[in-house]
Interface confidence: low
C-alpha cells in the first residue's frame, strides 16, 4: 500500500507590501507507531532550499535555525498535531515573493518534502488604505476621539507609526499626532477641512495614508441683515443688533438678505409684526424682496433661525417715509455704532 | 526636545576622507530616517541621501553615489557620514535632518563645515 | 530627479508689507512641499510642512498654499527678523530636492 502524503494549500496567495496574511493549510503523513511517539516536526522552504541544511522561514522546531529576515514574520499557526500548517506571513516585504515548500519530519521513517503542492507568494505594491474611525457627527466643542488603523496589518514584525496632519489638529506637538489615538476637540472653522492619517511600518519605506473632510456640526453664529436698495446705488445696510430703525422712501424698492453660519444649514424665516411671511415672497436662501413699499408696509422685521444646536434671531424696523428727501439715514433705538457699509 | 548635535568643522586635504557625526535625542531613534544635506557656500540644499537607523538601510542620491557612506550607531542613537576621496568641490556645510513622514524634515541639525583645502 | 524652481533670486519689500515666494515643480508633487528660511550662517529653519501646514511656533503670518506643481509661500506683515534666505523642498519622492532659494531683502 502506498503510504499516504497529502496537503491542503492554496496553490498561490497575493498580499500587499507591510500587510499580513494567514495561509490556510493541512496536511497529512503515514504513522502506525504503536510503540514509541518521536516529536513531530513541520517546516516551510523556501522553494530550491535543501531541507538539510538550509534555513528555514518557519519551524516548530527549535532547534533548526530560521532565516534572520522571516523570524518573527513566518510564523506556524494552529497545532500541527492536529495536522494544521497553516502559516502567517506579517509585514509582508516585496523580497519575501516567490515560491514555498511544505515539509515533515518524524523519527526515521516520515522525512518528506511536499514538493508537488508549492506555495505562490506574491508581494504587491501598498495600495490598502488606513481607516479613520470617529463617532459622527462632530459637534464643535465637544471631544471626540479619532482612531486610525490599516486594514489588513497584525501583530508580526516593527510596529506601524502613525502621524496625523490637519488645520483642525493645529498646533499640536508631533508626538501628540504620533499616536493611533486622537482626541480632538472640533471648532466651526474646522468644517470642510481635511484630516489626514499616514501609518508607516517602522523601518520600511512603506507608507499609506487616507484623508476625510471633517463634518463639524455648529450652532448658528454671525447672523446678519443686509439691506439692499434698488436705487442704482447698490449700497448694503448690513444689521448686526436688534432695534435699528431704518427710515425709507414710499414706492422704493428693497431685498432684505437674512444670513447666518451654521451646520448644518439652519432654517430661516421672516416675520413682520411678530406674523410669518408669505413663502412666496421669501427664497429659500433667506432673501425677502419688498418691492414698491407702501406706506403701511413699515413696522418691525425679524429673521428667524431654526437649528438643532440653537435659535436665534434679529429684528430691525422699518420706517416708511413719505417725503421726497433723497438721502439714506439710519438711526438706532439704542446707543451704539453706526452699522457697516458695506 | 528633539535635537541633533553635529560634529565640529573639518579642515582636510584633498583626497583624504572625513567623517561627520550627528547624535539625536528626544525621540526613538530607530523611528525615523536621518536624511544627509549638503549646501556649498552661497548655493542651495542637495540632498545627499539618507539612512534608515531601524535596519541599517542606507538610500545614495545618484549624483553623490561613491561620494559617502552612511552608517549608524544604534547604541549611542548616532548617524555618521562618511565622506571619500575629497575635492574642492566637496568642501561644504553637511547637515543631518530627522524625516518625520508627512511633516518634512522639522528638525536640522547645526551643521558641520568640512573645508578641503591643501 | 523633480525640479524645484524658485524664479525670484531676490525680492525686496519693506516692513509691515506683505510678500509672495513662489515655487514651481517639474512634476505633481501633491501637496509634499515644505519652506524653510536660513539666516547667513544658520542652520535652516523648518517653517511650513504639506504645502500649508505650519509648524509649531512658527508665526501665523507665514503662510503657505498651492498643490500639485504650483506653491507659494506668503508673509504678510513682514518684519525686519524675516530678512532671510526661503527655500522650498519636495518630498513626494526621492531624492528629496530643494528649490535654488529666495533672498528676502527689507527696504
Known amino acids: 500500500e502506498k503510504p499516504v502524503y497529502e496537503l491542503q494549500v492554496q496553490k498561490s496567495v497575493t498580499v500587499q507590501e507591510g500587510l499580513c496574511v494567514l495561509v490556510p493549510c493541512s496536511f497529512s503523513y503515514p504513522w502506525r507507531s504503536w510503540y514509541s511517539s518521536p516529536p513531530l516536526y513541520v517546516y516551510w522552504f523556501r522553494d530550491g532550499e535543501i531541507p538539510y541544511y538550509a534555513e528555514v522561514v518557519a519551524t516548530n522546531n527549535p532547534d533548526r535555525r530560521v532565516k534572520p529576515e522571516t523570524q518573527g514574520r513566518f510564523r506556524l499557526l494552529g497545532d500541527v498535531q492536529k495536522k494544521n500548517c497553516s502559516l502567517s506571513i506579517g509585514d509582508a516585504r516585496m523580497e519575501d515573493t516567490g515560491s514555498y515548500f511544505f515539509r515533515v519530519e518524524r523519527g526515521r521513517d516520515v522525512k518528506y518534502s511536499y514538493q508537488q503542492n508549492k506555495l505562490n507568494l506574491e508581494v504587491t505594491a501598498l495600495i490598502e488604505k488606513p481607516d479613520i474611525h470617529f463617532l459622527e457627527p462632530l459637534e464643535s466643542g465637544r471631544p471626540t476621539r479619532l482612531s486610525c488603523s490599516l486594514p489588513g496589518s497584525c501583530e508580526a514584525g516593527p510596529p506601524l507609526t502613525f502621524s496625523w496632519t490637519g488645520n483642525a489638529l493645529s498646533p499640536l506637538d508631533p508626538e501628540t499626532t504620533r499616536s493611533s489615538e486622537l482626541t480632538l476637540t472640533p471648532r466651526p472653522e474646522d468644517h470642510g477641512t481635511n484630516l489626514t492619517c499616514q501609518v508607516k511600518r517602522q523601518g520600511a519605506q512603506v507608507t499609506t495614508e487616507r484623508t476625510v473632510q471633517l463634518n463639524v456640526s455648529y450652532a448658528p453664529q454671525n447672523l446678519a441683515i443686509s439691506i439692499f436698495f434698488r436705487n442704482g446705488t447698490g449700497t448694503a445696510l448690513r444689521i448686526l443688533s436688534n432695534g435699528m430703525s431704518v427710515p425709507i422712501q414710499e414706492g422704493q424698492s428693497l431685498f432684505l438678505a437674512c444670513t447666518v453660519d451654521s451646520n448644518p444649514p439652519a432654517s430661516l424665516s421672516w416675520f413682520r409684526e411678530g406674523k410669518a411671511l408669505n413663502p412666496s415672497q421669501t427664497s429659500m436662501s433667506g432673501t425677502l424682496e419688498l418691492p414698491n413699499i407702501g406706506a403701511r408696509e413699515g413696522g418691525e422685521f425679524t429673521c428667524r433661525v431654526q437649528h438643532p444646536l440653537g435659535s436665534q434671531h434679529l429684528s430691525f424696523i422699518l420706517s416708511v417715509q413719505r417725503s421726497s428727501s433723497s438721502c439714506i439715514c439710519v438711526t438706532e433705538k439704542q446707543q451704539g455704532s453706526w452699522p457697516l457699509l458695506t | 526636545e528633539i535635537q541633533l548635535q553635529q560634529s565640529g568643522p573639518e579642515l582636510v586635504k584633498p583626497g583624504a576622507s572625513v567623517k561627520v557625526s550627528c547624535k539625536a535625542s528626544g525621540y526613538s531613534f530607530t523611528d525615523y530616517n536621518m536624511y544627509w544635506v549638503k549646501q556649498s557656500h552661497g548655493k542651495s540644499l542637495e540632498c545627499f541621501g539618507y539612512?534608515?537607523?531601524?535596519?541599517?538601510?542606507?538610500y545614495y542620491n545618484q549624483k553623490f553615489k561613491g561620494k559617502a557612506t552612511l552608517t549608524v550607531d544604534k547604541s549611542s542613537s548616532t548617524a555618521f557620514m562618511h565622506l571619500n576621496s575629497l575635492t574642492s568641490e566637496d568642501s561644504a556645510v553637511y547637515y543631518c535632518a530627522f524625516y518625520y513622514g508627512y511633516y518634512g524634515v522639522p528638525y536640522w541639525g547645526q551643521g558641520t563645515l568640512v573645508t578641503v583645502s591643501a | 530627479d523633480i525640479v524645484m524652481t524658485q524664479s525670484q533670486k531676490f525680492m525686496s519689500t519693506s516692513v509691515g508689507d506683505r510678500v509672495s515666494v513662489t515655487c514651481k515643480a517639474s512634476h505633481n508633487v501633491g501637496t509634499s512641499v515644505a519652506w524653510y528660511q536660513q539666516k547667513p550662517g544658520q542652520s535652516p529653519k523648518s517653517l511650513i510642512y504639506?504645502?500649508?501646514y505650519r509648524y509649531s511656533g512658527v508665526p501665523d503670518r507665514f503662510t503657505g498654499s498651492g498643490s500639485g506643481t504650483d506653491f507659494t509661500l506668503t508673509i504678510s506683515n513682514v518684519q525686519s527678523e524675516d530678512l532671510a534666505e526661503y527655500f522650498c523642498?519636495?518630498?513626494?519622492?526621492?531624492?528629496?530636492?530643494f528649490g535654488s532659494g529666495t533672498k528676502l531683502e527689507i527696504k
Open positions: 539612512i534608515d537607523p531601524y535596519n541599517g538601510g542606507p
Open positions: 504639506s504645502a500649508s
Open positions: 523642498q519636495q518630498y513626494n519622492s526621492y531624492p528629496l530636492t
